[in-house]
């Protein structure tokens, strides 16, 4: 969370940004809020990126002004126009690229004053893992798969019964480069599992952490997965 203040004569407005992460190939949001102002025609929003000449996006007089937009962002940006009046200056970024990572500035001017705040935008790939029982193996095993990760993550297994146990000796993890030659498919197999136990497959890089849980009993298999972005908010 980054809060910036701006001074315009006697007036300053608070601008707040949130560090966030983009999943490459998907759409992302760079979050920025400011003190609301009902006078839409007096609101100017400018998004800038460190090291880039020209603007990422500009919104003024109630509409986009892309005359100074840098070509790397052409056709990829939009503000939430109906939300600007309530202080939402967040930027929607289409088809996030690895090169979109960096420091951005959200600059705001309203009839009340002006202000700005920076945000760090991280880019990478992250996806939910899916765990299945691998019945083809010679001994009962679990297969944890996640289709898209970058940078290369670490993978660890845990078990509810054997808490603190190190499963690295009884697991095998591989990373397979996807067709676009950036992201990788993660596959990890855990051998010698026992029934009536809950196992967790944890995949983590510097952007995200994902966990897949599986509980295998005689009668059923229960799965749960979750994903959280790191260093956000």
């Amino acid at each position: 969370l980054i809060i910036g203040f701006g001074i315009s004569g006697k007036h300053f407005i608070t601008v707040t940004t949130f560090t966030s992460a983009g999943n490459i190939g998907e759409d992302g949001t760079l979050s920025c809020t400011f003190e609301p102002d009902i006078k839409l025609n007096g609101i100017v929003i400018q998004w800038l990126k460190e090291g880039i000449k020209g603007l990422v996006h500009e919104f003024k007089e109630g509409k986009d002004d892309l005359s100074q937009q840098h070509e790397m962002f052409r056709g990829r940006t939009a503000v939430f126009a109906d939300q600007v009046v309530v202080g939402n200056a967040s930027l929607r970024l289409k088809n996030v690229q690895l090169t979109d990572a960096g420091t951005y500035t959200c600059y705001i001017r309203t009839s009340k004053g002006k202000g700005n705040a920076n945000l760090e935008y991280k880019t990478g790939a992250f996806s939910m893992p899916e765990i299945n029982v691998d019945y083809n193996a010679s001994s009962e095993s679990l297969r944890c798969e996640a289709p898209r990760w970058f940078p290369q993550p670490t993978v660890a297994w845990a078990s509810q019964v054997d808490q603190g146990a190190n499963f690295s000796e009884v697991s095998n993890t591989s990373f397979e480069l996807n067709s676009e030659n950036v992201t990788m498919k993660v596959v990890s197999v855990l051998y010698n599992v026992t029934i009536n136990n809950t196992y967790s497959c944890m995949i983590e890089n510097d952007i995200a952490k994902a966990t897949g849980d599986i509980k295998v009993t005689d009668s059923e298999v229960k799965r749960r997965s979750q994903l959280q972005l790191l260093n956000s908010g």
């Epitope: 006078k39 839409l40 509409k63 126009a81 109906d82 600007v84 309530v86």
Partner: antibody, heavy 117, light 107 residues
Framework: QLQLQESGPGLVKPSETLSLTCTVS??????????WSWIRQPPGKGLEWIGS???????YYNPSLKSRVTISVDTSKNQFSLKLSSVTAADTAVYYC?????????WGQGTMVIVSS | DIQMTQSPSSLSASVGDRVTITCRAS??????LNWYQQKPGKAPKLLIY???SLQSGVPSRFSGSGSGTDFTLTISSLQPEDFATYYC?????????FGGGTKVEIK
């Protein structure tokens, strides 16, 4: 779902102050950023925006009514209020409260206020 | 203040007809134009916001277009429940102002 309900006297004497309250139910008035607004409609006529307030206390009034209007908010009661002073027969109207972003998406059902001695 | 002029002020149409209502702003309001439907004794109901975005729950026969100063509300196939008064409203510059309304009546 969010509902708005206007309340207040239906009859006000000329030169007195009209006071209305809008009670928000089904959600908190503070949960997000909205312009809590008042709009009126004289009998058989069109709609007129009176003004709006943010929970921060910032107010915005129609210049044609600004000298007579006060809008306030009470987050503890989940209510916002309208006061219109020095009323005349021209202030007779149905008064609506509404929630707004850059559009008025949730409205109360309206309350008729007649200004008469 | 920005003046909003609606036309026509009233029209008669039959069920199934395509109906078009126009709204003109006295200065550019970008796309900050909203459309409401009001039935007698009821509060207005939001139909279209941001000139062309359909409000959740509103039938797809309603559509909006335009930007700048000229805007249109279209009902592609008029239904019995659509007979009402329609208002445009700008939220670009306070005071927010409404058009005078268009009453859609049964022919």
């Amino acid at each position: 779902q969010l509902q708005l309900q206007e309340s207040g006297p239906g009859l006000v004497k000329p030169s007195e102050t009209l006071s209305l309250t809008c009670t928000v139910s089904g959600g908190s008035i503070s949960s997000s950023v909205y312009y809590w607004s008042w709009i009126r409609q004289p009998p058989g006529k069109g709609l007129e925006w009176i003004g709006s307030i943010l929970v921060s206390g910032s107010t915005y009034y129609n210049p044609s009514l600004k000298s007579r209007v006060t809008i306030s908010v009470d987050t503890s009661k989940n209510q916002f209020s309208l006061k219109l002073s020095s009323v005349t027969a021209a202030d007779t109207a149905v008064y609506y409260c509404a929630r707004a972003v850059s559009f008025l998406d949730v409205w109360g059902q309206g309350t008729m206020v007649i200004v008469s001695s | 203040d920005i003046q909003m002029t609606q036309s026509p002020s009233s029209l008669s149409a039959s069920v199934g007809d395509r109906v078009t209502i126009t709204c003109r702003a006295s200065q550019s309001i970008s796309s900050y134009l909203n459309w409401y439907q009001q039935k007698p004794g009821k509060a207005p109901k939001l139909l279209i916001y941001g000139a062309s975005s359909l409000q959740s729950g509103v039938p797809s026969r309603f559509s909006g277009s335009g930007s700048g100063t000229d805007f249109t509300l279209t009902i592609s196939s008029l239904q019995p429940e659509d007979f009402a008064t329609y208002y445009c409203q700008q939220s670009y510059d306070p005071p927010w102002t409404f058009g005078g309304g268009t009453k859609v009546e049964i022919k």
